[in-house]
Every structure is written in structure tokens, then in C-alpha cells.
Interface confidence: low
């Protein structure tokens, strides 16, 4: 006997209780492929989530995060609180980057400044909480006429002794 369920299009399900009739998905559910025996419950974008695309009978809802949050995970499965540039998110909320680290985004963690000397270069622009240092040419690259130029001192914050 031919399986009549294979004829059921997306947006319907094969209702075994009704002689394999293709029944439309109930409200707040969907089937994205044909031949389904059940419809999936639509995702609910609530709380920190807001609806980017409404659920339809053939496709799931898609969520974004409300203002002040950003998406994490596949299909925005989580929302994480935004921080300011120069901060990172910890268990206790947004905290300023420690001296010697920076974060130039509203998300993610503070990362160490680039160590210019590892590449044989000098610090051209000091780092801040929000910005990495800018490395300049190595002293050997400087022309004799420019060799008297003093590279900027490493960035230092109040309360920190030079490292």
C-alpha cells in the first residue's frame, strides 16, 4: 500500500487518526518539509529575545536580541548582555579591562596588547582599554635622521608602576 504521507506538503502533517489525511499544522507550529507525521512547535522569542521573523506554517520563527544584548550560538540560541568597548562580561556584569588588555567591541573578552618587541618593533601608539597598541618600525629601520626620535613610553595608568 502506498504511503499517502509522502504526499503531504510542508505546512501540513500526516494525520494517522484521520486515514493519513494531510492536516494543516495547528497554530504556533510548523513543518518545513513534506511527509511529516507531526508539526514542530514554533520557537517563542520572548524576554531578551525579539521576533525577527514570525513563525509560519512552513518555517520556524527567527529571533534577535533586544537592545543592549547580542546573539550567541547557532540561530541566536542565546542573548548575552552588551558591554562597552574597554570592558568584558563577567559573572558580576561588565568590568573594565585590566591594564595591558583591551576590547574594541561590545562583546567578547579583553585581550592582551600586542607585544611590539617580539617582532623587533617599537610602540608607536600607546594601547588603551579600548584599543591595541600600534607598533612602529623597528629602531634598525629608522633612518639616521630619524633615529633621535624617542618612541612613546609604554602606556601607564594611575596606580600602576612601570612594568
Amino acid at each position: 500500500l502506498q504511503d499517502l504521507c509522502s504526499n503531504c506538503p510542508a505546512g501540513t502533517f500526516c494525520d494517522n487518526n484521520r486515514s493519513q489525511i494531510c492536516s494543516p499544522c495547528p497554530p504556533n507550529s510548523f513543518s518545513s518539509a513534506g511527509g511529516q507525521r507531526t508539526c514542530d512547535i514554533c520557537r517563542q522569542c520572548k524576554g531578551v529575545f525579539k521576533t525577527r521573523k514570525e513563525c509560519s506554517s512552513t518555517s520556524n520563527a527567527e529571533c534577535d536580541c533586544i537592545s543592549g544584548y547580542h546573539c550567541l550560538g547557532a540561530e541566536c540560541s542565546m542573548c548575552e548582555q552588551d558591554c562597552k568597548q574597554g570592558q568584558e562580561l563577567t559573572k558580576k556584569g561588565c568590568k573594565d579591562c585590566c591594564f595591558g588588555t583591551f576590547n574594541d567591541q561590545k562583546r567578547g573578552i579583553c585581550r592582551p596588547w600586542t607585544n611590539c618587541s617580539l617582532d623587533g618593533k617599537s610602540v608607536l601608539v600607546n594601547g588603551t582599554k579600548e584599543r591595541d597598541v600600534v607598533c612602529g618600525p623597528s629602531p634598525a629601520d629608522l633612518s639616521p635622521g630619524a633615529s633621535s626620535a624617542t618612541p612613546p613610553a609604554p602606556a601607564r595608568e594611575p596606580g600602576h608602576s612601570p612594568q
Epitope: 514554533c42 517563542q44 522569542c45 520572548k46 531578551v48 533586544i66 550567541l72 548575552e80 559573572k91 556584569g93
Partner: antibody, heavy 130, light 111 residues
Framework: EVQLVETGVEVKKPGASVKVSCKAS????????MHWVRQAPGQGLEWMGI????????SYAQKFQGRVTMTRDTSTSTAYMELSSLRSEDTAVYYC???????????????????????WGKGTMVTVSS | QSALTQPASVSGSPGQSITISCTGT?????????VSWYQQRPGKAPKLIIY???TRPSGVSNRFSGSKSGTTASLTISGLQAEDEADYYC??????????FGGGTKLTVLG
């Protein structure tokens, strides 16, 4: 005792702004979302918006977008609702109401308000009249 | 976002049961199990009596019960008492990350 204490009566002229405060006590202020709801004389309840006192993020009813600003001061456990460009139809009692849900998780961000308003302030009567 | 639809008034005699309906759409009442009911007496702030469609907060009489079918939620008050006379409001979460209230229902206890 868990309670929300709002400012008293406010009388404003059309075009002005009003800032209503709501001081929370008896619970951890940053652990519960706060809603603002208003009620015009003889009329029903109208949801205005919600603020997460932990991060300060907000979501406003479309009707009030651009006119309402919800803020909070965690040091005093106080939520604020400011409504600008007042008109006579803004005459109403303005309530702050705590959301029943608890337990914001910074790592997942998956804290969702329940939408049940379990603790209400007594309301601030705002009259807009020329 | 339109207000949820409630009857303007209902009435009943002491001891009777009454039901107040709250009709929305698939974007609010029909789409979520986040329907709440509030009792408001004159000059007072609203009081939560039902949330999550059927759940009663502690301290609320078991004479109050909630249910939902499709896009309509209902509040039933059994064994009606004079003190139940008040305005009743439903509210629901919506797919726009907002909440919406019903227009309110005035309950009159006869006799």
C-alpha cells in the same frame, strides 16, 4: 517586606516632561525585571515598557517609543520612568510593577520575564493640564 | 498591538460561578502560555491572581482558576462572594517582546 514606593502627585503642562520614580525595598533590586503600567481615569491598564535593572536594557511599547525613557539607579534600588512631550491624554496613574521571574544568568543571557506583575507600587497620579 | 477583548461587565449572585473571557490572537494569547489575571478594587493597585494561564500565587483563594483554549483565556470565580466585586484584567505576552492588557471587566455581585 517587599514593596515599591513611587513619587506622589505630579501636575504638568502640555509639552513638558515628567519623571516618576519607584524605590524598591525588601528584595534584590537587580534580580527582577520592572514594568511600567499606566491607567487613565476610568480606563483600563496599559503596558508601557520593561527595564532589566541588572543591565539597564529596556523594551518599550510601540505607542510610547521616542517619548518614554526607563532608567534605574542600582545604588538606590530605584527605577525611573520619564515621559516627554506630555499631552492631556497622558493624564493617568503610573504604576511600577515587579516581574515575578527571577534569576538572570549572565553567561547564557537566557533570563526571560514571566510577565506576571506580582508587586505593584501604589501609583503616581500625573495630571497634564494647561 | 490592540488590547485583548474582555466583556465590559459580568454579574452573578453569591455562591454562583462566573467566567470572564479574554480573547486575543495567535501572536499573544494563542501563541504563549503567559496569560495573567489581575483584580483591581476601586482606588487600589491591581493584584495578581493568576499567572502562566493556570497558576495561582500563594495566598490567592482556590475559588479563582484560569484556563485557555486557542486564542481565548478564561478566569472562573466559583462560590462568588461580595468581596469579589472588582474590576478584572487579563494580560498576555506578545510576539513583539511586549505585553498587552485586556480592556477590563467589571464584576458585580448581586444581592
Amino acid at each position: 517586606e517587599v514593596q515599591l514606593v513611587e513619587t506622589g502627585v505630579e501636575v504638568k503642562k502640555p509639552g513638558a516632561s515628567v519623571k516618576v520614580s519607584c524605590k524598591a525595598s525588601g528584595y534584590t533590586f537587580t534580580s527582577y525585571y520592572m514594568h511600567w503600567v499606566r491607567q487613565a481615569p476610568g480606563q483600563g491598564l496599559e503596558w508601557m515598557g520593561i527595564i532589566n535593572p541588572s543591565g539597564g536594557s529596556t523594551s518599550y511599547a510601540q505607542k510610547f517609543q521616542g517619548r518614554v525613557t526607563m532608567t534605574r539607579d542600582t545604588s538606590t534600588s530605584t527605577a525611573y520612568m520619564e515621559l516627554s512631550s506630555l499631552r492631556s491624554e497622558d493624564t493617568a496613574v503610573y504604576y511600577c510593577a515587579r516581574d515575578l521571574g527571577e534569576g538572570y544568568d549572565f553567561w547564557s543571557g537566557y533570563y526571560t520575564p514571566s510577565g506576571a506583575f506580582d508587586i505593584w507600587g501604589k501609583g503616581t497620579m500625573v495630571t497634564v493640564s494647561s | 498591538q490592540s488590547a485583548l477583548t474582555q466583556p465590559a461587565s459580568v454579574s452573578g449572585s453569591p455562591g454562583q460561578s462566573i467566567t470572564i473571557s479574554c480573547t486575543g490572537t495567535s501572536s499573544d494569547v494563542g501563541g504563549y502560555n503567559y496569560v495573567s489575571w489581575y483584580q483591581q478594587r476601586p482606588g487600589k493597585a491591581p493584584k495578581l491572581i493568576i499567572y502562566d494561564v493556570t497558576t495561582r500565587p500563594s495566598g490567592v483563594s482556590n475559588r479563582f482558576s484560569g484556563s485557555k483554549s486557542g486564542t481565548t483565556a478564561s478566569l472562573t470565580i466559583s462560590g462568588l462572594q461580595a468581596e469579589d466585586e472588582a474590576d478584572y484584567y487579563c494580560s498576555s505576552y506578545t510576539s513583539y517582546s511586549t505585553w498587552v492588557f485586556g480592556g477590563g471587566t467589571k464584576l458585580t455581585v448581586l444581592g
